[in-house]
């Protein structure tokens, strides 16, 4: 066959759908690879062809669009399952072509099973709610395009295994779930089950997401450097190991990049000839505030090193801060036989 622009297997779009539920999957060519949409392609005489490779097989097969009740169908650039079956799992390819042009991409589709409490291997999206921030809502995701606006589905919300009704601060409002005042106790998995009729049949869409309650922007502060501080003096003799921790607290901030770094005499450690190592550890609180510790280490410190300026810097979306460590050379204790004896008038 003639050459075809093959975008390969797009593993970035690992699509997971539940068994025995409708699924609509758009050809990724138009979403991520080509500069034109399906309508333009169709108007230009290009045809969209679908085929697949079953799980654990190498053979590409055409998709059977003649199944009973049109279980699998194609509509424009969308492949429809009404509903899915477990053995629909595999790699699906959509190819756009005519006599002079060809472009194709494959993507993995995994049909997963869920138990009666909606537990499954499905990767769950995470929705972050600010703690004690006032009314916040989550919306049942990825249900657009499954039924026309004239159809009024029924939506049932669950937290874990339990139907949400008469909860203190969580109120179902159709496609939305409202949290009056989000608290740590609201952390968990929330599931919406959307039930709608189509051609005399009833379909269910199950969507689960993880709610994580995080620090509120009302309480967010610039980074706080806990160490170094004024209470600790790093007093060392030449030859000893110098260890200075830089410990910084970062308030949770959505999409903030938290940074910690050391400078020595105003330069990054990489730009300095001294043998310095830096080890970093990160911990998080329940509301995703972050504490970063970078330990600066000089194995055998010299008297020159003890005269340098060691500064811990930190930056977040809330601002930048820095703090210098108090470093000094330890004055050696007097040797009794010489210095002290002289003081007593010994000769």
């Amino acid at each position: 066959s003639e050459r075809c622009d093959d975008w390969g297997l797009d593993t970035m779009r690992q699509i997971q759908v539940f068994e025995d539920e409708p699924a609509r999957i758009k050809c990724p060519l138009f979403e991520h690879f080509l500069k034109f949409n399906y309508s333009t392609a169709h108007s230009a005489g290009l045809t969209l062809i679908w085929y697949w490779t079953r799980q654990d097989r190498d053979l590409e097969e055409p998709i059977n669009f003649r199944l009973p009740e049109n279980r699998i169908s194609k509509e424009k650039d969308v492949l429809w399952f009404r509903p899915t079956l477990l053995n629909d799992t595999g790699n699906y390819t959509c190819m756009l072509r005519n006599t002079t042009y060809c472009s194709k991409v494959a993507f993995p589709l995994e049909v997963v099973q869920k138990d009666s409490c909606f537990n499954s291997p499905m990767k769950l999206p995470v929705h972050k709610l600010y703690i004690e921030y006032g009314i916040q809502r989550i919306t049942c995701p990825n249900v657009d395009g499954y039924f026309p606006s004239s159809v009024k589905p029924t939506i049932t919300w669950y937290m874990g295994c339990y139907k949400i009704q008469n909860f203190n601060n969580v109120i179902p409002e159709g496609m939305n779930l409202s949290f009056l005042i989000a608290l740590i106790s609201n952390n968990g998995n929330y599931t919406c089950v959307v039930t709608y009729p189509e051609n005399g049949r009833t379909f269910h869409l199950t969507r689960t997401l993880t709610v994580k309650v995080v620090g509120s922007p009302k309480n967010a502060v610039p980074p706080v450097i806990h160490s170094p501080n004024d209470h600790v003096v790093y007093e060392k003799e030449p030859g000893e190991e110098l260890l200075i921790p830089c410990t910084v607290y970062f308030s949770f901030l959505m999409d903030s990049r938290n940074e910690v770094w050391w400078t020595i005499d105003g330069k990054k450690p990489d730009d300095i000839t001294i043998d310095v190592t830096i080890n970093e550890s990160i911990s998080h609180s329940r509301t995703e505030d972050e504490t970063r510790t970078q330990i600066l280490s000089i194995k055998k410190v010299t008297s020159e090193d003890l005269k340098r300026s060691y500064v811990c810097h930190a930056r977040s979306a809330k601002g930048e801060v820095a703090k210098a460590a108090k470093v000094k050379q330890k004055v050696p204790a007097p040797r009794y036989t010489v210095e002290l004896a002289c003081g007593f008038g010994a000769t």
Epitope: P222, V224, D230, G266, V311, E320, V321
Partner: antibody
Framework: SVEESGGRLVTPGTPLTLTCTVS????????MGWVRQAPGKGLEWIGT?????STYYASWAKGRFTVSKTSTTVDLTITSPTTEDTAIYFC???????????????WGQGTLVTVSS | DVVMTQTPASVEAAVGGTVTIMCQAS??????LAWYQQKPGQPPKLLIY???SLASGVPSRFKGSGSGTEFTLTISDLESADAATYYC???????????????FGGGTEVVVK
């Protein structure tokens, strides 16, 4: 930005309040300081107020000056001016937020106070 | 209080030359030192903090060094725009605490020929 106002000619002993108006940042995040400069002389630190409203003064300035603040202004009151208090008074913001090591990264243009009978 | 002593009071150098200003603290201030530049009729401008860290936008011709009680500001490749008075400042008090405290040196006038 940081801008001082309130400087004028006053007679000795008449209290005077200088105001520093800030914009673009929150006073709850920064230490703010007052520094003065007598004509032809060097810089002299008077006092500082932190984000929570605690105040710190140079030993010579205690009792002679009061630093206070609102949500967008920092005030310096000269309680009983003398002719030695004639100077340009600068309001300045700490370089880094939340830091008690105060080195001033942002300064106003200063306001002139003249104390004369 | 920590007393900051600057030397010399005035220094003169040619364009392209190098100037060194000294600052001595009456007791150890570790690396707790900042340097400012002030031109006539203008407020001071922060050049260096924590002894050697350059403030934003300050050229690398300005270099701070020292520790404990002895500190130096070196200006190399001197430009006519560097003519100004330079001040050192610490934020440590006599107990080695920083809590909003400040103490300035007496200043050094740099004259560029």
């Amino acid at each position: 930005s940081v801008e001082e106002s309130g400087g004028r000619l006053v007679t000795p002993g008449t209290p005077l309040t200088l105001t520093c108006t800030v914009s673009g940042f929150s006073l709850s995040d920064y230490y703010m300081g007052w520094v003065r400069q007598a004509p032809g002389k060097g810089l002299e630190w008077i006092g500082t107020i932190d984000g929570g409203g605690s105040t710190y003064y140079a030993s010579w300035a205690k009792g002679r000056f009061t630093v206070s603040k609102t949500s967008t202004t920092v005030d310096l009151t000269i309680t009983s001016p003398t002719t030695e208090d004639t100077a340009i008074y600068f309001c300045a913001r700490n370089y880094y937020a939340g830091l008690s090591d105060v080195f001033f990264g942002w300064w106003g243009q200063g306001t002139l106070v003249t104390v004369s009978s | 209080d920590v007393v900051m002593t600057q030397t010399p009071a005035s220094v003169e150098a040619a364009v392209g030359g190098t100037v060194t200003i000294m600052c001595q603290a009456s007791e150890t201030i570790y690396s707790g030192l900042a340097w400012y530049q002030q031109k006539p009729g203008q407020p001071p401008k922060l050049l260096i903090y924590y002894t050697s860290s350059l403030a934003s936008g300050v050229p690398s011709r300005f270099k701070g060094s020292g520790s404990g009680t002895e500190f130096t500001l070196t200006i190399s490749d001197l430009e006519s725009a560097d003519a100004a008075t330079y001040y050192c400042q610490t934020y440590y008090d006599s107990e080695g605490r920083s809590y909003g405290y400040n103490s300035f040196g007496g200043g050094t006038e740099v004259v560029v020929k």
